[in-house]
Interface confidence: medium
């Protein structure tokens, strides 16, 4: 029956001290891990991989390196200035045989707009990706190549959650056997046909994504063909039947009252840790109202926070969240009005999310300012608008054409924003820096890996 199918990939997620420094608390880090895993779970579960359906993800274990671990010699991710290939290698030098995949989340600004890196799975041979076991490689080191890394920073800015979720889905897509999309069928965002182009590129597009186009969180047919071949061959090696929650992964899942991790991680006076006997683990301790693992509206003293306490900061598009006094959850924040400016006036709020372009405020569409001969690139990091479906009207917000809306004020894209039709990202000097999708690969060829591994790592 379907329920007995091995369709769940169990994850080990580690975060480094810089990720912790950005999000501030263990609970906030766990919420980030949870949101990323749920996002890819939704994408993969709703994709039919040539008859293989309901592929899901579950966190088996987490390790959060806090700022206190910055000097810990047992923490391999403690070094401040590590390139993306080295960072992936540090993850791969650990033994991850107990997991389908092992990821590290960081907040580092890697070179050239790289947001992630992962080993690519293949249907045959020991090449990396899902279920790959630790082996000795030609540089004399044992490595687990069922690994990947992602960062939430790009050119000094933090990427929006939807982009980070797609980055994670993209890197996991490599682990599952998909190379980058190529060819007209699988890169519609590069099409000259406006109807095709407006839906954007798919998850495995090699360069940049905004995350808000129809295709951005879907796999292309190219990816589906590749992934289904790898799943066919590999999933029985390490996938498990879905169902039981995993007490100890720090996430409160169905059937658990709380989850503060294993005894070495649990700092929670409210919850029985995962090393406790079966009837007690991941249950609230007697007389305790809640556990901080359930949400930000529970105090360390195991009581619901009072009605007036803030649990979520006011953001560009949503008002602050206020605890309601009877649940650990942070209630929904009321959205700010649609078309409120956000992301430093480059975008507008839609249903509480900073999602639309500032152009939409005036009934226009965002476009890329690029001269047809490709020589004039100084406006590539301007916000440019056009009349709907009329690229001939595309002009910078600073142009005379749109002066009635923007009063001649040039609005520039935020650093880290996609530019030049998603071929690159804007840097801090407002230059559009093209993404070299295979840059780290080329550097790795000069490094420590043997030739048979070269084609099996990708951004």
């Amino acid at each position: 029956t379907t329920s007995a199918e091995k369709n769940t990939c169990q994850l080990y997620i580690q975060t480094d001290h810089l990720f912790f420094k950005y999000y501030g608390t263990r609970e906030a880090v766990i919420a980030q891990i949870s949101s990323h895993v749920k996002a890819i779970d939704t994408i993969y579960q709703t994709t039919d991989f040539s008859g293989i359906r309901n592929i899901s993800f579950m966190v088996k274990r987490i390790r959060i390196n806090t700022t206190a671990d910055e000097k810990d010699p047992t923490n391999p991710f403690r070094f401040p200035n590590i390139g993306v290939e080295k960072f992936l290698e540090l993850n791969s030098e650990q033994n991850h045989d107990d997991y389908c995949l092992a990821y590290v989340f960081t907040d580092r600004d890697f070179d050239d707009g790289v947001l992630g890196l992962a080993w690519v799975g293949a249907p045959s041979g020991s090449s990396g990706g899902i279920c790959e076991k630790s082996k000795l490689y030609s540089d004399g080191k044992k490595k687990s190549l069922n690994t990947g890394i992602i960062t939430v920073q790009n050119y000094g800015s933090h990427v929006p959650p939807k982009v980070s979720h797609i980055t994670f889905a993209h890197e996991v897509g490599h682990n599952f056997g998909s190379p980058h999309d190529s060819g007209t069928e699988c890169t519609p965002g590069e099409s000259k046909n406006l109807g095709q182009k407006e839906n954007g590129n798919y998850i495995m597009y090699a360069r940049a994504t905004s995350g808000d186009k129809l295709n951005n969180n879907k796999f292309s047919l190219c990816s589906i063909r590749n992934i289904s071949q790898v799943l066919e061959k590999k999933r029985n090696n390490c996938f498990v039947e879905s169902g039981q929650p995993i007490c100890g992964n720090g996430m409160v899942e169905q059937g658990e009252e709380c989850d503060c991790g294993y005894s070495d991680q649990c700092k929670d006076e409210c919850c029985f840790d995962a090393n406790q006997p079966e009837g007690r683990k991941c249950k609230l301790k007697p007389g305790k109202q809640c556990s901080p693992s359930q949400g930000p509206c529970c105090t360390a003293q195991c009581a619901f926070k009072s009605k007036s306490e803030k649990c979520r900061d006011d953001s560009d598009c949503a008002r602050e969240g206020i605890c309601n006094g009877f649940t650990a959850l942070c209630p929904a924040s009321d959205p700010k009005p649609n078309f409120t400016d956000c992301n430093r006036h480059t975008q507008v709020c839609i249903n509480g999310q900073c999602a639309g372009s500032i152009c939409e405020k005036y009934g226009l569409e965002e476009c890329t300012c690029a001269s047809s001969d490709g020589k004039d690139d100084k406006e590539l990091c301007h916000v440019c608008c056009m009349k709907k479906m009329d690229p001939s009207t595309c002009a910078s917000t600073g142009s005379v054409q749109w002066s009635r809306h923007f009063s001649g004020r040039t609005i520039t894209l935020q650093p880290g924003s996609p530019c030049n039709d998603f071929r690159g990202y804007c840097d801090v000097f407002m230059r559009c820096r093209l993404v070299d999708a295979d840059g780290p690969l080329a550097r790795l060829k000069k490094a420590i890996f043997s030739p048979e591994l070269y084609e099996n790592i990708a951004e």
């Epitope: 919420a31 980030q32 949870s34 949101s35 990323h36 749920k38 996002a39 939704t42 579960q45 709703t46 959650p161 979720h165 929650p245 996430m251 409160v252 899942e253 169905q254 059937g255 658990e256 009252e257 709380c258 989850d259 359930q294 949400g295 649940t327 650990a328 959850l329 209630p331 929904a332 924040s333 249903n351 509480g352 999310q353």
Partner: nanobody, 116 residues
Framework: EVQLVKSGGGLVQAGGSLRLSCAAS????????VGWYRQAPGKQREMVAA???????NYADSVKGRFTISRDNAKNTVYLQMNSLKPEDTAVYYC??????????WGQGTQVTVSS
């Protein structure tokens, strides 16, 4: 995008009962927190019942002992059983689900009117 379809509202006498249901597209309620909110005319929207992803439930003091939140994963549906209704329970009721740490957008809501 999450689609939430509410039903079960209506007019009821004080002391009566109603069951609201909220069906979702896909198995979105599994492993996600869900909540029922209400908004009475001229008042702030307030959460009245919540179910954490683990299944434990919490209620606003004003409805504790009268309202029960539950879910049926097989039907992708969340329910709010409302007993011993009072005129002050009159409001538009919304269900909501937390997806990727963000609460899904508000739907139309369903009107509940309790007459005395």
């Amino acid at each position: 995008e999450v689609q939430l379809v509410k039903s079960g509202g209506g007019l009821v006498q004080a002391g009566g009962s109603l069951r609201l249901s909220c069906a979702a597209s896909g198995n979105i309620f599994i492993n996600n927190a869900v909540g029922w909110y209400r908004q009475a005319p001229g008042k702030q929207r307030e959460m009245v019942a919540a179910m954490l992803s683990g299944g434990s439930t919490n209620y606003a003091d004003s409805v504790k002992g009268r309202f029960t939140i539950s879910r049926d994963n097989a039907k992708n549906t969340v329910y709010l059983q409302m007993n011993s209704l009072k005129p002050e329970d009159t409001a538009v009721y919304y269900c909501n689900v937390q997806v990727n740490g963000i609460w899904a957008r508000w739907g139309q809501g369903t009107q509940v009117t309790v007459s005395s």
